[in-house]
């Protein structure tokens, strides 16, 4: 029976700069029941606070709701692991909410084959930004990436869409079912997960000829 091993705060993410969650990996448990607590203070302050919500983010997590989240302050946090034989502390982690934003994936992905009479046919893809992100304030610029592939292909074709919420794809294989996904990223931060796949059957008469 030993004191617990050193825990590690390995990830902090915010969906929208208004709330955020941090997760830690426990160290070895020393063969005894171990309690974990996350404490933090804001840069420039000495007053320590305990995690306000250990539930929302799931096991080994701390969630900071709106009232605990400030964009303009750096958070300095650590996790304490304690059992009957002693304690151990993680390294301190410095967190600036501005740089840990990982939005939800875009929504309402729609895919349609367009076959204008006078031009080449194309696949038209459009989507909406995630609901938690308020683009009107100007605090956020979201960039988008699309990936698509024939159903049985192993490799995805990836297209960068910039800030657009629609995109055209010209080169497709007729008669194939295509999978399409989209994801987004703030100017500072992380790519969202890919949206669920939307699929579309490309007509056999879809022609790529001029």
């Amino acid at each position: 029976q030993l004191p617990p091993g050193k825990p590690e705060i390995f990830k902090c993410r915010s969906p929208n700069k208004e709330t955020f969650t941090c997760w830690w990996r426990p160290g070895t448990d020393g063969g005894l029941p171990t309690n974990y607590s996350l404490t933090y203070h804001r840069e420039g302050e000495t007053l320590m606070h305990e995690c306000p919500d250990y539930i929302t983010g799931g096991p080994n997590s701390c969630h900071f709701g709106k009232q605990y989240t400030s964009m303009w302050r750096t958070y300095i946090m650590m996790v304490n692991a304690t059992n009957q034989m002693g304690s151990s502390f993680s390294d301190e982690l410095y967190v600036d909410v501005t740089y840990i934003v990982q939005p939800d994936p875009p929504l309402e992905l729609a895919v349609e084959v367009k076959q204008p009479e006078d031009r080449k046919p194309y696949l038209w893809i459009k989507w909406s930004p995630p609901t938690l992100i308020d683009l009107k304030t100007g605090w956020f610029t979201l960039l988008y990436e699309i990936r698509l592939k024939p159903e049985k292909a192993a490799e995805w074709e990836i297209h960068f869409a910039g800030q657009q919420t629609e995109f055209k794809i010209l080169s497709l294989h007729p008669g194939q079912k295509y999978l399409v996904q989209v994801r987004c990223k703030p100017d500072h931060g992380y790519w969202s997960a890919w949206s669920p796949a939307t699929f579309i059957q490309i007509p056999s008469d879809f022609t790529m000829n001029d």
């Epitope: 992905l109 729609a110 049985k152 949206s195 669920p196 796949a197």
Partner: antibody, heavy 114, light 107 residues
Framework: QVQLVQSGAEVQKPGASVKVSCKVS????????IHWVRQAPGKGLEWMGN????????IHAQKFQGRVTMTGDTSTDTAYMELSSLRSEDTAVYYC???????WGQGTLVTVSS | EIVMTQSPATLSVSPGERATLSCRAS??????LAWYQQKPGQAPRLLLY???TRATGIPARFSGSGSGTEFTLTISSLQSEDFALYYC?????????FGGGTKVEIK
């Protein structure tokens, strides 16, 4: 012809873990992201999560946070779903499903009973 | 999470008649909606995706309509093999969710 063949029925005690396998044929697992769906006896369908073998990314329903692990072995074209800390309400038929929902495994009955 | 509500819970129809099943989403899912049929002891079978596109091998008597939050599955002339459970499911965003199902039974 794409087929998803799942491992056999399991009986587990509360608190234990179960690992269900899903062997893909007629397709390469790398090309096929896998959903896991379960159905308790006499109840409706419940989506558990998705595993994308191409990039190893997993997404799961919040209620399974910390209990479900979805993995895959591309060398054998087999996907796995492990559910830990089992309780009686986890008794269900577990299905693996291809990304476009038109390929379903035959289902694996997991019974949790002391 | 988007809640999918199906109605009615049970639909009693005579063979040869038309059956109309409804599915409502608590927020817009665009056209990212699938319909399934399930018979006792079997895995579900995909009928429609994209709200209205028939899956491979699905007879023309099955049709779907709707977008946004209101969707309908229509079976134009019920055959004996169509008496089963039907589920809708959105795939607009994570998590995917299913409706509670509609049982189509012989009147």
């Amino acid at each position: 012809q794409v087929q998803l063949v799942q491992s056999g029925a399991e009986v587990q005690k509360p608190g234990a873990s179960v690992k269900v396998s899903c062997k893909v044929s007629g397709y390469t697992l790398t090309a096929l992201s896998i959903h896991w769906v379960r159905q308790a006896p006499g109840k409706g369908l419940e989506w558990m999560g998705n595993f994308d073998p191409g990039d190893g990314e997993t997404i799961h329903a919040q209620k399974f946070q910390g209990r479900v692990t979805m993995t895959g072995d591309t060398s054998t074209d087999t996907a796995y779903m492990e559910l830990s800390s089992l309780r009686s309400e986890d008794t269900a038929v577990y299905y693996c499903v291809g990304v476009t929902f038109d390929y379903w495994g035959q289902g694996t009955l997991v019974t949790v009973s002391s | 999470e988007i809640v999918m509500t199906q109605s009615p819970a049970t639909l009693s129809v005579s063979p040869g008649e038309r059956a109309t099943l409804s599915c409502r989403a608590s927020q817009s899912v665009a056209s990212n909606l699938a319909w399934y049929q399930q018979k006792p002891g079997q895995a579900p079978r995909l009928l429609l995706y994209g709200a209205s596109t028939r899956a491979t091998g699905i007879p023309a008597r099955f049709s779907g309509s709707g977008s946004g939050t209101e969707f309908t599955l229509t079976i134009s002339s019920l055959q004996s093999e169509d008496f089963a459970l039907y589920y809708c499911q959105h795939y607009n965003n994570w998590p995917l969710t299913f409706g509670g199902g509609t049982k189509v039974e012989i009147k």
